[in-house]
Interface confidence: low
Amino acid sequence: AWELTILHTNDVHSRLEQTSEDSSKCVNASRCMGGVARLFTKVQQIRRAEPNVLLLDAGDQYQGTIWFTVYKGAEVAHFMNALRYDAMALGNHEFDNGVEGLIEPLLKEAKFPILSANIKAKGPLASQISGLYLPYKVLPVGDEVVGIVGYTSKETPFLSNPGTNLVFEDEITALQPEVDKLKTLNVNKIIALGHSGFEMDKLIAQKVRGVDVVVGGHSNTFLYTGNPPSKEVPAGKYPFIVTSDDGRKVPVVQAYAFGKYLGYLKIEFDERGNVISSHGNPILLNSSIPEDPSIKADINKWRIKLDNYSTQELGKTIVYLDGSSQSCRFRECNMGNLICDAMINNNLRHTDEMFWNHVSMCILNGGGIRSPIDERNNGTITWENLAAVLPFGGTFDLVQLKGSTLKKAFEHSVHRYGQSTGEFLQVGGIHVVYDLSRKPGDRVVKLDVLCTKCRVPSYDPLKMDEVYKVILPNFLANGGDGFQMIKDELLRHDSGDQDINVVSTYISKMKVIYPAVEGRIKFSTGSH
């Protein structure tokens, strides 16, 4: 028997520095977790102790903090090289700055293979990107070889900016011929490494003949065997075992997100490359693991540019940006309108001639807007200003919901109106009218939504049984502020871009902003 140790990360999302337990900015260093310096300590410890070790990343290193905003992927290449990753799969967020924003900082600089079997380049891009990413890579490990085959969510064109010269194929259809090719090369130990979410990971384990292990990402799935060491609740045991259509037991793993854990999977293969046993658990990278001094020093050196950036002007406002609680928790506020407009703008993807855009709606809990911005400071808006407005380090995500769920969400928005509670919704692409004289649960008297399948966008009444795409904070997608109906009833959830980054990009693009209160949210009494 031959033993392989797979160390894996996924959805690190720009958390190069250690973070608090909830993966936001580190406040109390003695309680902080993760970060590349701490990750390196643990990886090195395992590399010294065990003979056959692979360090893999399942995508979405890009996007999530000011590190990505400033360094645009150069930081990912630099620190992944320093940690000596063996391979990485492309995630949807690797395309956030377009194909150029992937090629220049990461594909050309990475000293490790970057993989995806289901992304096919066409047109002029085909020659430009040729060889910079691969469908698979055969890696020597000790006396053996291991094949790593990559995959990426086929939803990427809706979630990021890959452009028109990359085709995202069905994962299973694309993976099978690559695995077959590896078999013809006498590679009998094959890992599928990719970024399509836990449900697809399990399908790959079931359907793709010849895949021995699946290492996934995208859904931020936490798996654990035994008592979990922190706040994350396991979605299943680690590894999660799938019985393939041809009767094999295939371990599937993921390691939550944000570099909080290092996935640790030990696989025993027989001489024919069959998995005899698999066991392990994610390792919580808490403060009991010291940060590596040399990586930490490097991080501190790179940090200097971030501090300078946060005080530079992004753009100007010529109006007061009212982010006060007494506005945003009680009525339409122009800060809410600005943020929602930025959220929609960040999700413009012209993928179908029938649709002007794939999504037109935004909802945003008023309690998530934490500060106004005064226009009398020369109108200057800085990253620092935006960090006061959006201090929680969340993301703006894409969900699919039925109209009936949206109606429940808007009823919840005003079910205890007047108490300055955070659930009051700010909106974009939605016109809502409330009648507060009616009993809670029956206060939404009009709810119109902006069409997407139209050349001239206009507002139509919400249809209860129709499925709509909505951009919202991850806090709401996870049921925060009492929006349990969103969490329970959502049909799809894809994590998006860092909230501050979305708004800062929009302001930089617009240069001068003047959001108004324009009647998106109205109140009526009696008949309207």
């Epitope: 609680s325 007494q326 300055s420 955070g422 806090f475």
Partner: antibody, heavy 119, light 106 residues
Framework: QVTLRESGPALVKPTQTLTLTCTFS??????????VGWIRQPPGKALEWLAH???????YYNPSLKSRLTISKDTSKNQVVLTMTNMDPVDTATYYC???????????WGQGTLVTVSS | DIQMTQSPSSLSASVGDRVTITCRAS??????VAWYQQKPGKAPKVLIY???YRYSGVPSRFSGSGSGTDFTLTISSLQPEDFATYFC????????FGQGTKLEIK
């Protein structure tokens, strides 16, 4: 329902360190948006905000007293602890802990504990 | 820091009177102001937040108004239980309180 209770010494000597504990129930400091603050009131005088801790361990202090104050929390025990160094007779006051709403007004208060600084 | 100057510092009135207490902030605090009532030996109780919003359970005779730097707490018809000390508080920057207004029976 929400309750808060302050505990600590009734008498401290000048230059000593005061440690006060706020034990609360009816809410959890691990819930997003929750916070607990400390406010004091010298006899017959106005209220003065001292410090505040959020659910995510973010801490804020009154700038004029910052060097003397430390606030911490033990989420599992539902407690928040305030320490104040180098006590002086002018620090004689009733010390209150209060739950801070998502912005910074205080809806729920403890009954207060009178601390006298005297040799 | 932001000073909150309350006036008057004391006030005598009778049951049924309309009473107004004012608070002036040393700089613009928008509507980030709360009002509290405190009785001897007791903790303060919030009456008004965000300058004009009555906290749940507070009688409708209490109302607040103002924005920017000038704020008012009004008791439309004094009741016996209203005789107490009233404090304003701003929370636009770190919280600061007014020095209090003692409302006594005439």
């Amino acid at each position: 329902q929400v309750t808060l209770r302050e505990s600590g010494p009734a008498l401290v000597k000048p230059t000593q360190t005061l440690t006060l504990t706020c034990t609360f129930s009816g809410f959890s400091l691990s819930t997003s948006g929750m916070g607990v603050g400390w406010i004091r009131q010298p006899p017959g005088k106005a209220l003065e905000w001292l410090a505040h801790i959020w659910w995510d361990d973010d801490k804020y202090y009154n700038p004029s007293l910052k060097s003397r104050l430390t606030i911490s929390k033990d989420t599992s025990k539902n407690q928040v602890v305030l320490t104040m160094t180098n006590m002086d007779p002018v620090d004689t006051a009733t010390y209150y802990c209060a739950r801070r709403e998502r912005w910074a007004w205080f809806a729920y208060w403890g009954q207060g504990t009178l601390v006298t600084v005297s040799s | 820091d932001i000073q909150m100057t309350q006036s008057p510092s004391s006030l005598s009135a009778s049951v049924g009177d309309r009473v107004t207490i004012t608070c002036r902030a040393s700089q613009n605090v928008f509507t980030n102001v709360a009002w509290y009532q405190q009785k001897p030996g007791k903790a303060p109780k919030v009456l008004i937040y965000s300058a004009s919003y009555r906290y749940s359970g507070v009688p409708s005779r209490f109302s607040g108004s103002g924005s920017g730097t000038d704020f008012t707490l009004t008791i439309s018809s004094l009741q016996p239980e209203d005789f107490a000390t009233y404090f304003c508080q701003q929370y636009n920057s770190y919280p600061t309180f007014g020095q209090g207004t003692k409302l006594e029976i005439k």
